[in-house]
């Protein structure tokens, strides 16, 4: 008789999840000499231990502490790039500007990027059929709690000038409900962080508006200022050209406006 299984509203665990996490860990530790000491089997065991046999709506930050400890990593605290709703461009940028780092450039962020996972209460099985959706099912699910935990730690580590890329094409350029708006903003440490600098990425080719005047950006400025952190905002009008010119400033097309 097939055992009854809870049906969640979200997609199930990414196929070949254990193999993917292990392979990513091995690849990352090979590329980053400062993380060569990491034992990837122990990392996978700690990752697995955070959610296997636990109810996928009852996961806590505490569950991830063994993994956090194994994945402890020092990135230059003044070279941090946060992002909201514009992950691809942020990652393309740090691939070119190699001295800046997004969360996904760290070991733990790299392991979990774009993956989904969950288990089942009281069984050692991984659920490949469905996992809880943050909105429709529950917020304390394995994926959401993981990102909340690593995002909080990443923001807490930041110092000096912290940059954030925001999507100027969205109706809410700054969204209080995003991970950036609900977690990272509130965990920047005013005694270490002098300035939060927002880079608003424009979508339209002919869009010459100053999106730094957008009401949601003003809301972000207000939240940040109340936390005794200075705020600065920049418009990136031509993100494609911007990236190209960061990559190769001598390029002839970079001698005109970007």
């Amino acid at each position: 008789v097939p055992r009854w299984r809870q049906q969640w509203s979200g997609p199930g665990t990414t196929k070949r999840f254990p193999e993917t996490v292990l392979a990513r860990c091995v690849k990352y530790t090979e590329i980053h000499p400062e993380m060569r000491h990491v034992d990837c089997q122990s990392v996978w065991d700690a990752f697995k231990g955070a959610f296997i046999s636990k109810h996928p709506c009852n996961i806590t930050e505490e569950d991830y502490q063994p993994l956090m400890k194994l994945g402890t990593q020092t990135v230059p605290c003044n070279k941090i790039l946060l992002w909201s709703r514009i992950k691809d461009l942020a990652h393309q940028f740090t691939q070119v500007q190699r001295d800046m780092f997004t969360l996904e450039d760290t070991l733990l962020g790299y392991l979990a990027d774009d993956l989904t996972w969950c288990g089942e209460f009281n069984t050692s099985k991984i659920n490949y059929q469905s996992c809880p959706d943050w909105r429709k099912d529950c917020s304390n699910n394995p994926v959401s709690v993981f990102w909340k935990t690593v995002s909080r730690r990443f923001a807490e580590a930041a110092c000096d000038v912290v940059h954030v890329m925001l999507n100027g094409s969205r109706s809410k350029i700054f969204d209080k409900n995003s991970t950036f708006g609900s977690v990272e903003v509130h965990n920047l440490q005013p005694e270490k962080v002098q300035t939060l600098e927002a880079w608003v990425i424009h979508g339209g080719r002919e869009d010459s508006r100053d999106l730094c005047q957008d009401p949601t950006i003003k809301e972000l400025e207000s939240i940040i200022s109340k936390r005794n952190i200075q705020f600065s905002c920049k418009n990136i009008y031509r993100p494609d050209k911007f990236l190209q010119c960061v990559k190769n400033p001598e390029d002839s097309s970079c001698t005109s406006e970007i």
Epitope: Q97, D99, V161, Q194, D210, I236, Y237, F242, C254, I258
Partner: nanobody
């Protein structure tokens, strides 16, 4: 810390020259336009010159065109303003600023800038 620090001001005879510098320290990434403004006593700051992020595009106010030259060195994180053929009416406090964008679209407007340095006094005697 992001700091813009203008220096190089002083007292000079009419017809003389000065070179102002603006160091933009604390920057991981210097991909934004920058500009020079000046302020006469009791007046608003006025635009003098601006330069885009790469140094390839510049803009000058009519009153300084042909006499002043703006440039930048992103490796040294410094912007310059070479001021030749100085006139007594150039006497002012000069400020450097970092723009809200990489290019010169709104470079003549004060609102187009969001980081300002402390000023440096330039006095031209006749």
């Amino acid at each position: 810390d992001v700091q813009l620090q203008a220096s190089g001001g002083g007292l000079v005879q009419a017809g003389g020259s000065l070179r102002l510098s603006c160091e933009f320290s604390g920057r991981t990434f210097s991909g934004f336009a920058m500009g020079w403004f000046r302020q006469f006593p009791g007046k608003e700051r006025e635009f003098v010159a601006a330069i885009n992020w790469s140094g390839s595009s510049v803009d000058y106010s009519d009153s300084v065109k042909g006499r002043f030259t703006i440039s930048r060195d992103n490796v040294k994180s410094t912007m310059y303003l070479v001021m030749n053929s100085l006139k007594p009416e150039d006497t002012a406090v000069y400020y450097c600023a970092e723009a809200r964008s990489a290019e010169l679209g709104s470079s003549r407007k004060i609102q187009g800038y969001d980081q300002w340095g402390r000023g440096t006094q330039v006095t031209v005697s006749s």
